[in-house]
C-alpha cells in the first residue's frame, strides 16, 4: 500500500511521511520564514541576510516551493510506482526465500528459547517452592522458639520468684539454727555434765552389782553345799537311829565317799542333790578352767544347762567370733553360755537340746531334739541336731543339715551375702535360714515386719520378733 | 518400720482379669526383692511370682506363668501383679512381702518363703462365674 501525508511537529516545523508497503519516508524541510532569496526566486542557495523581509513575500515563496515539492512528490511517487512494477515478481521471490530461511532459523532459536525458558521456569518453580517450604519451616520454627522462649521466661520469672522466696526462707532458717544452735550447745553442756554424772554413778552400781553377783554365787553356792550337807547329815542320822534301834547291830563306822566339788554340767550338780534353780560353776571337761552357768532345776525334771537367754534385750548380742567362742553377758539374765565349753561337753556324751520360746501375746512353745551337738572351732562349732518334736513347729527352724557358726567378723554361712551383718548376732546361718534366736531385740508392738529381730519362723512365721527365748542341754540318758 | 499395703482384688468371672498392687513403705525397691503369695483356704501359702533389681529379674510359679506378669514402679515405691486368663483354681488370699534381695543361697536365683520378712495384710481374689 501506499500514502501520503502532510503534518506540522511540536517545533512547528512542516514534515512530509510517505508511508509504502512496510517502509516509511520521513522528509523535514528547512525554514524559509527567516530565509531571502539572492536574485533568482528559484535560487535558495544564497547568502543569509541581515535583515528581515516582509511577510507577503515570504508567504509567496513559500507557495511557489510547496509547488515545486509536490511536483517532485509526484514524480517521486511515479518512479516508485515504475520500480514496484518492475521489481514486485522479483522481490517477491527474494522475499520469499529469506522469509523461509529465516523462519526457520527463527522456529529453531524459538524453540531452544522456549526450552530453555520451560527449563528456567521448572527450576524457578522448583526454587520456589523450596523457598516457601524453607520459609513455611522457618515461620514454625520461629513460633515455636518464639513459644519456648515465652514459656522460659515465664519459667525464668517463676523461679526467680522461687529463689528469692527460698532465699528470704533460707535467711529466716538460718538465722533459727543459729539461735537453736546456742541452744543447743548450752543443752549439750548441760547433758555433758549429766552423763559425766551418770558415768560416775553407773561404774559405781557396776561395782556394787558385781560384788553383789559375787555374794549372790558364793551364797548360791554355799546354799547348795548346805542342802547337800543337810541331806548328807539327815541320812546319816536316819541310819544312825535305825542302828541305835537295831539290837542286833554292830557299832560300826560309816564310811562316805569322797564328796565331788566339780561338775561338767547342771544334770551332775541336780544329781548331787542340788535341785534349786540358779548360777552354779562347771568345770571344763579334762581340765580346771570354770565356767559360770544357769542350771534350771524345775523345767521338765531338772538338770537342764542353759547355753543362751533372751528376755529383755538388756544384753547386745551383735558380738565377735571370741565373745561367742568364750561366752558373754550374765548367767542371771541374758547370756550366751560360750561355743567352745558347749563343743566339749557335748563333744563326750549324747545331749538333748531344749529350745523355750514365749511371744508377746502370752503364748510358749518349744522344740525339743534328740540329739544336739555342737562341731569344734576347727569347723565353726558346726551344729548337728536330730529327732525333732514340741509344740514351736513340725519342721526345724534350725536349717538342717547343720550350718556353720557365723558372727559380724567371721562370715560362714551360704549367702552371698554376710547374714551376721545383715540380721544381726551370731547364729548357725543358712542363707540366711528360718531362725536367729541372737538377733535384735524388739519391743512390744514394734516387733513385726523385722528383717533382723528374734525369729523362729516354722511358729510365728517370718519377720515376728520373739518376746523370750532360752536353750538349754541335758545328756540324753539323764 | 515396714510397711506392705495390697489393693486391687475383688470378684471376677472365668477368663478375665485384675491387676493387684503392692505399695510398699520403709523400704527401697533397689535393695529389696518382692514376692507374691497366695493361701487357699485349708491350703498351705505359695509363692506365686517374685521381683528383683527394678524388674530385671522375674520369677513365676508354674501354675501362673504365660498368665500372670509381674512388674515395678520404683518411683511409687509400688509392685504390680497383672492377672489374665482367670481360673477358679486362683481364687486365694494374696500377700505381697519383702526380702532384702542380697539374702540368696549361693547358686540359687530366689528365696525361700521363710526369707520374706515383712508381709502385707493380703487381698482376697474371688473367681467364679
Known amino acids: 500500500y501506499s500514502n501520503f501525508r502532510k503534518s506540522v511537529d511540536s517545533t512547528g516545523r512542516r514534515q512530509y511521511q510517505v508511508q509504502n508497503g512496510p517502509c516509511s519516508y520521513t522528509f523535514l524541510l528547512p525554514e524559509t520564514d527567516s530565509c531571502r532569496s539572492s536574485s533568482s526566486p528559484y535560487m535558495s542557495n544564497a547568502v543569509q541576510r541581515d535583515a528581515p523581509l516582509d511577510y507577503d513575500d515570504s508567504v509567496q515563496r513559500l507557495q511557489v516551493l510547496e509547488n515545486i515539492l509536490e511536483n517532485n512528490t509526484q514524480w517521486l511517487m511515479k518512479l516508485e510506482n515504475y520500480i514496484q512494477d518492475n521489481m514486485k515478481k522479483e522481490m517477491v521471490e527474494i522475499q520469499q526465500n529469506v522469509v523461509q530461511n529465516q523462519t526457520a532459523v527463527m522456529i529453531e532459536i524459538g524453540t531452544s528459547l522456549l526450552n530453555q525458558t520451560a527449563a528456567q521456569t521448572r527450576k524457578l518453580t522448583d526454587v520456589e517452592a523450596q523457598v516457601l517450604n524453607q520459609t513455611t519451616r522457618l515461620e514454625l520454627q520461629l513460633l515455636q522458639h518464639s513459644i519456648s522462649t515465652n514459656k522460659l521466661e515465664k519459667q525464668i520469672l517463676d523461679q526467680t520468684s522461687e529463689i528469692n522466696k527460698l532465699q528470704n526462707k533460707n535467711s529466716f532458717l538460718e538465722q533459727k539454727v543459729l539461735d537453736m544452735e546456742g541452744k543447743h550447745s548450752e543443752q549439750l553442756q548441760s547433758m555433758k555434765e549429766q552423763k559425766d554424772e551418770l558415768q560416775v554413778l553407773v561404774s559405781k552400781q557396776s561395782s556394787v552389782i558385781d560384788e553383789l553377783e559375787k555374794k549372790l554365787v558364793t551364797a548360791t553356792v554355799n546354799n547348795s553345799l548346805l542342802q547337800k550337807q543337810q541331806h548328807d547329815l539327815m541320812e546319816t542320822v536316819n541310819s544312825l537311829l535305825t542302828m541305835m534301834s537295831s539290837p542286833n547291830s554292830k557299832s560300826s563306822v560309816a564310811i562316805r565317799k569322797e564328796e565331788q566339788t566339780t561338775f561338767r554340767d547342771c544334770a551332775e550338780i541336780f544329781k548331787s542333790g542340788l535341785t534349786t534353780s540358779g548360777i552354779y560353776t562347771l568345770t571344763f571337761p579334762n581340765s580346771t578352767e570354770e565356767i559360770k552357768a544357769y542350771c534350771d532345776m524345775d523345767v521338765g525334771g531338772g538338770g537342764w544347762t542353759v547355753i543362751q537367754h533372751r528376755e529383755d534385750g538388756s544384753v547386745d548380742f551383735q558380738r565377735t567370733w571370741k565373745e561367742y567362742k568364750e561366752g558373754f553377758g550374765s548367767p542371771l539374765g541374758e547370756y550366751w553360755l560360750g561355743n567352745e565349753f558347749v563343743s566339749q561337753l557335748t563333744g563326750q556324751h549324747r545331749y538333748v537340746l531344749k529350745i523355750q520360746l514365749k511371744d508377746w501375746e502370752g503364748n510358749e512353745a518349744h522344740s525339743l531334739y534328740d540329739h544336739f551337738y555342737l562341731a569344734g572351732e576347727e569347723s565353726n562349732y558346726r551344729i548337728h541336731l536330730t529327732g525333732l518334736t514340741g509344740t514351736a513347729g513340725k519342721i526345724s527352724s534350725i536349717s538342717q543339715p547343720g550350718s556353720d557358726f557365723s558372727t559380724k567378723d567371721s562370715d560362714n554361712d551360704k549367702c552371698i551375702c554376710k547374714c551376721s551383718q545383715m540380721l544381726s548376732g551370731g547364729w548357725w546361718f543358712d542363707a540366711c535360714g528360718p531362725s536367729n534366736l541372737n538377733g535384735q531385740y524388739y519391743p512390744q508392738k514394734q516387733n513385726t515386719n523385722k528383717f533382723n529381730g528374734i525369729k523362729w519362723y516354722y511358729w510365728k512365721g517370718s519377720g515376728y520378733s520373739l518376746k523370750a527365748t532360752t536353750m538349754m542341754i541335758r545328756p540324753a540318758d539323764f | 518400720e515396714v510397711q506392705l499395703v495390697e489393693s486391687g482384688g475383688g470378684l471376677v468371672q472365668p477368663g478375665g482379669s485384675l491387676r493387684l498392687s503392692c505399695a510398699v513403705s520403709?523400704?527401697?525397691?533397689?535393695?529389696?526383692?518382692i514376692g507374691w503369695f497366695r493361701q487357699a483356704p485349708g491350703k498351705e501359702r505359695e509363692g506365686v511370682s517374685a521381683?528383683?533389681?527394678?524388674?530385671?529379674?522375674?520369677y513365676y510359679a508354674d501354675s501362673v506363668k504365660g498368665r500372670f506378669t509381674i512388674s515395678s514402679d520404683n518411683s511409687k515405691n509400688t509392685v504390680y501383679l497383672q492377672m489374665n486368663s482367670l481360673r477358679p483354681e486362683d481364687t486365694a488370699v494374696y500377700y505381697c512381702?519383702?526380702?532384702?534381695?542380697?539374702?540368696?543361697?549361693?547358686?540359687?536365683?530366689?528365696?525361700?518363703?521363710?526369707?520374706?520378712?515383712?508381709w502385707g495384710q493380703g487381698t482376697l481374689v474371688t473367681v467364679s462365674s
Open positions: 521381683i528383683r533389681e527394678s524388674g530385671g529379674s522375674t
Open positions: 512381702a519383702a526380702v532384702p534381695a542380697g539374702r540368696l543361697r549361693y547358686g540359687e536365683q530366689w528365696y525361700p518363703i521363710y526369707e520374706y520378712d515383712a
Open positions: 520403709g523400704i527401697t525397691l533397689d535393695d529389696y526383692a
